[in-house]
Amino acid sequence: EVEKTACPSGKKAREIDESLIFYKKWELEACVDAALLATQMDRVNAIPFTYEQLDVLKHKLDELYPQGYPESVIQHLGYLFLKMSPEDIRKWNVTSLETLKALLEVNKGHEMSPQVATLIDRFVKGRGQLDKDTLDTLTAFYPGYLCSLSPEELSSVPPSSIWAVRPQDLDTCDPRQLDVLYPKARLAFQNMNGSEYFVKIQSFLGGAPTEDLKALSQQNVSMDLATFMKLRTDAVLPLTVAEVQKLLGPHVEGLKAEERHRPVRDWILRQRQDDLDTLGLGLQGGIPNGYLVLDLSMQEALS
């Protein structure tokens, strides 16, 4: 806390300007009127205050707005935003996307801080859903944002927002998240033609069920191995050798290099060896010829 001291004669601030950088902390506290600061917040960011000085300015705003800052002040916080705690931010009501952008800009190039996470949470909750413009903004600043959300939070993403998602935005998503996002993507891109559809849906395929993979295998999509390796194991297992061959097209040769890794390894174990041999890749570990395969999961379902 800064001690309450009288402002020295002639030092009372009449406006927020560069002269204030030469004020000591106690002088800022004594000589800068909080209401003046609030109305001229847009000037603060252009003035090279130290963070020590910004602490004093924050203290003045906190006294003026104990219930939380109005959006007119929040929008112009600039670097002062970095001095806010998550507790401060929870008092705010941020409704403007421009305000959100202005504050995210301050943290640009740095990883998401607890302040930013709280701000985004407040903003999204206030909007009720993660609309396309918000998602566009958030993924532009934080490509990994989408994958930081829980499956429950992702369920509030409308299919229309999926158009804003870039492949790199999904890099760190786990299967549970892709399970939620894939149906939305399928819905969003449903009116596109085959090759265009595949380009858009490709990065979401880690959430695709078997029947969709079977359908894709009929469309000459030539899926690359990197995409294939991200598919759900349970979705890949029921695919036949012929379906996988059609799905991968010329990339089928890459199976050999991945034969010890999931889902390829598990898929090989489910195929007849003579079917695998038709690929001519030397894949080993299939079911020997003459063996009968019992699907016990089906048996359990029937009993």
Partner: nanobody
Framework: EVQLVESGGGLIQPGGSLRLSCAAS????????MGWHRQAPGKGRELVST???????YYANFVKGRFTISRDNSKNTLYLQMNSLRAEDTAVYYC?????????WGQGTLVTVSS
Amino acid sequence: EVQLVESGGGLIQPGGSLRLSCAASGNIGSIRHMGWHRQAPGKGRELVSTITTVGTTYYANFVKGRFTISRDNSKNTLYLQMNSLRAEDTAVYYCRATAHPTDYWGQGTLVTVSS
């Protein structure tokens, strides 16, 4: 993290000149502006001069026309050229970098102006 190391201080006669240097290392890309502060014996620390990343400079009234702040981005070094030195300029001079999201300080270099 940003590390700052000052040098160039020493004993100088009134009217003489000195050039202080501050070498910055670490996460220098996060620096927004840098400055020189000083603390005279028995007094509080005060800002002498600041320079922004775009080269805008600011000077305290007590050094205007005598001191010049500059930076060499290729060497990641901040300078303070001090001319016409007076006895009242005697102080420990500190380099400061305001970077994301805090202020970083050097350990200081002592300047003594005395005949």
